[in-house]
């Protein structure tokens, strides 16, 4: 069954998926889709890479890691409850039926207000919901915490500015990883 990852509304959600290229720069096409992995390809494709680059992506979906080294983990920006669901990471290894498929379950929960410490007054005057880090266990994602009821542009900008580069490292062990070659 799929591994479950969690985030709160307004955060950036992180779905880990990795492979090890046979040689540096020897990349394998990858697709991400919303919905469980079908027999071939990805359904409802949100992002795709080829042997060289990201060649298709849709708004709010991007690769934050170094995909040239096989980190094809998906970041979904500024999530809402409707982003909940199963996501498919498909490593499209050449050959018949060689693809590696990973189904990852993303569950979005409502954001929670955390009372702001007084020393954060300047920040919370503009953004009254404090940012915290919420861990959800080793097999689940850790993401930036609650955000205020502000407009989507503010949330998106703030989330981008506050992305924590540790998250990818923390999750590498629990994410989907395969070695090629």
């Amino acid at each position: 069954s799929e591994v479950e990852y969690r985030a709160e509304v307004g955060q950036n959600a992180y779905l880990p998926c990795f492979y090890t290229p046979a040689a540096p720069g020897n990349l394998v096409p990858v697709c991400w889709g919303k919905g469980a992995c079908p027999v071939f390809e990805c359904g409802n494709v949100v992002l795709r890479t080829d042997e060289r680059d990201v060649n298709y992506w849709t708004s709010r979906y991007w690769l934050n890691g170094d995909f040239r080294k096989g980190d094809v983990s998906l970041t979904i920006e500024n999530v809402t409850l409707a982003d909940s669901g199963i996501y498919c990471c498909r490593i499209q290894i050449p050959g018949i039926m060689n693809d590696e498929k990973f189904n990852l379950k993303l569950v979005i929960k409502p954001a929670k207000v955390t009372p702001a410490p007084t020393r954060q007054r300047d920040f919370t005057a503009a953004f009254p919901r404090m940012l915290t880090t919420r861990g959800h266990g080793p097999a689940e994602t850790q993401t930036l915490g609650s955000l205020p009821d502000i407009n989507l542009t503010q949330i998106s900008t703030l989330a981008n500015e506050l992305r924590d580069s540790r998250l990818a490292n923390d999750l590498r062990d629990s994410g989907a990883t395969i070695r090629i070659g």
Epitope: T80, A82, G85, V107, I108, K109, D149
Partner: antibody, heavy 119, light 107 residues
Framework: QGQLQQPGAEVVKPGAAVKLSCKAS????????MQWIKQRPGQGLDWIGE????????DYNQNFKGKATLTVDTSSNTAYLQLSSLTSEDSAVYYC????????????WGPGTLVTVSS | DILMTQSPSSMSVSLGDTVSIICHAS??????IGWLQQKPGKSFKGLIY???NLEDGVPSRFSGSGSGADYSLTISSLESEDFADYYC?????????FGGGTKLEIK
């Protein structure tokens, strides 16, 4: 998917308070947020608020702040809606509803409790 | 608050017909919409969530579509048990808000 049980009716006097219950069974109570909704004939549906049974965190509709209080008792898998200072405007059917597996907030509904405010 | 404008408020239809109910939100709700059914004198049943997904046990004759601020619920090949009230609800923003409802009646 589980069940939500609510008493059928409550009759209360103006100015009094009432505590409505919603007993959950057949699922992990603390894993899913609970919503409360008010329905008055000819007035449509009003969202009152929601509560996370895992930590008692609540979100309220500003229109119901001071009127409604949401709580849970995890030992009995029961969510509660307390309504205070009741008036005839509070006469309505009150529903609890819980979220589904993929964060669908209004997936499963209780049968509702009819509250009648009358002297 | 986000205003959910639902239309029509009522419609008379025949068994076997296909019907669509529309909900227009006062702003983009990014598919954060559900559709609910209420039979006379009864409680509610969730039909559709996140715009297009069927809740467990809901027949495939129900479907949801839409994006941005405009969404619809379609019921194909209406059966007798489908005559009921239908509501949309948005949950992209607090407070959650509901459409005014659509009453499906037998012609």
């Amino acid at each position: 998917q589980g069940q939500l049980q609510q008493p059928g009716a409550e009759v209360v006097k103006p100015g009094a308070a009432v505590k409505l219950s919603c007993k959950a069974s057949g699922y992990t109570f603390t894993s899913y947020w609970m919503q409360w909704i008010k329905q008055r004939p000819g007035q449509g549906l009003d969202w009152i608020g929601e509560i996370d049974p895992s930590d008692n965190y609540t979100d309220y509709n500003q229109n119901f702040k001071g009127k409604a209080t949401l709580t849970v008792d995890t030992s009995s898998n029961t969510a509660y809606l307390q309504l205070s200072s009741l008036t005839s405007e509070d006469s309505a059917v009150y529903y609890c509803a819980r979220e589904g597996a993929f964060s669908s907030p209004f997936a499963y509904w209780g049968p509702g409790t009819l509250v009648t405010v009358s002297s | 608050d986000i205003l959910m404008t639902q239309s029509p408020s009522s419609m008379s239809v025949s068994l076997g017909d296909t019907v669509s109910i529309i909900c227009h939100a006062s702003q983009d709700i990014r598919s954060n919409i559900g559709w609910l059914q209420q039979k006379p004198g009864k409680s509610f049943k969730g039909l559709i969530y996140h715009g297009t997904n069927l809740e467990d046990g809901v027949p495939s004759r129900f479907s949801g579509s839409g994006s941005g601020a405009d969404y619809s619920l379609t019921i194909s090949s209406l059966e007798s048990e489908d005559f009921a009230d239908y509501y949309c609800v948005q949950y992209v923003q607090f407070p959650r808000t509901f459409g005014g409802g659509t009453k499906l009646e037998i012609k």
